[in-house]
Amino acid sequence: MMTGTIETTGNISAEKGGSIILQCHLSSTTAQVTQVNWEQQDQLLAICNADLGWHISPSFKDRVAPGPGLGLTLQSLTVNDTGEYFCIYHTYPDGTYTGRIFLEVLESSVAEHGARFQIP
């Protein structure tokens, strides 16, 4: 039975040209995390595998950095980066947990972080 929950940074906003950290955290389970995928809509941005380490998609290499931790840093943000991002935790023995983050990239300097929320 899957008892864990994913806590994410929720709805966040950032300025064009700036950077943002996407973070998820798996709690309420003793399952072992074997891999974390970061996806934007249907595009795979990066994978952190417990055995093999990080692999960043070459398409995003110049604008995506691994970490901190299992998170992902997006740099040189553009308005086109606005949208949904997913952290997908592969675990043993539980299976797969998915968290969602919505990022809005703003032209102005009024970007503020949204509240944190949980996805069961």
Partner: antibody
């Protein structure tokens, strides 16, 4: 078009070190992807040996740990394999390959290495 | 290590036949499975990754399915140029491992 070409001695004596190089053309080895070595003993299945990232960090097959070293020379756009203390069991066709999320989308032509005295 | 077991080890089929090769893994690899085709004396060629995503330039008669521990490569209508050995490979952990291969021949 990305191309990979292996080179190195075809014959190595037992207990010596096998050294191979893979030259990449059509793509910079520092521009993403991982760069792998895979081998295939005569009539047997493929065996993954290890890889080097564009950053220079490495990951090896635990079965070869202590014997294997993978390095790269970014100025020549090539990466290399060294395998020490070889035995007849290391006789194989050695392939270099480009890795994307740990599957292999581009392969070299392969080079045969025989371990014999 | 994750063990990869392919079946059958060899098979013979006629042109136009539907051919199925299976790969079973010793533990859950989710969808992280690739298939390669190696023609006699040639280099392995990527056919499919992530269980079902066709590599660039691969004919649509090839397809993949499965998840967890059981996976299938299907050739919907066998062609003479499909004579080869087919290997599965997981891309999920260290060490990356391959199946022992399935040798496909034409009747």
């Amino acid at each position: 078009e990305v191309q990979l070409q292996e080179s190195g001695p075809g014959l190595v004596k037992p207990s010596e070190t096998l050294s191979l190089t893979c030259a990449a053309s059509g793509y910079s080895i520092t521009s993403g992807y991982d760069w792998h070595w895979i081998r295939q003993p005569p009539g047997k299945k493929l065996e993954w040996m290890g890889f080097i990232r564009d950053s220079g960090s490495t990951v090896y097959n635990p079965s070869l740990k202590g014997r294997i070293t993978i390095s790269h020379d970014t100025s020549k756009n090539q990466f290399s394999l060294k395998l020490s203390s070889v035995t007849a069991a290391d006789t194989a066709v050695y392939f270099c390959a480009r890795g994307l999320f740990w599957y292999f989308d581009v392969w070299g032509q392969g080079t045969t290495v025989t371990v014999s005295s | 290590d994750i063990q990869m077991t392919q079946s059958p080890s060899s098979l013979s089929a006629s042109v136009g036949d539907r051919v199925t090769i299976t790969c079973r893994t010793s533990e859950n690899i989710f969808s992280y499975l690739a298939w390669y085709q190696q023609k006699p004396g040639k280099v392995p060629k990527l056919l499919i990754h992530n269980t079902k995503t066709l590599a660039e330039g691969v004919p649509s008669r090839f397809s993949g399915s499965g998840s967890g521990t059981d996976f299938t490569l299907t050739i919907s209508s066998l062609q003479p140029e499909d004579v080869a050995t087919y290997y599965c490979q997981h891309h999920y952990g260290n060490p990356l491992t391959f199946g022992q291969g399935t040798k496909l021949e034409i009747k």
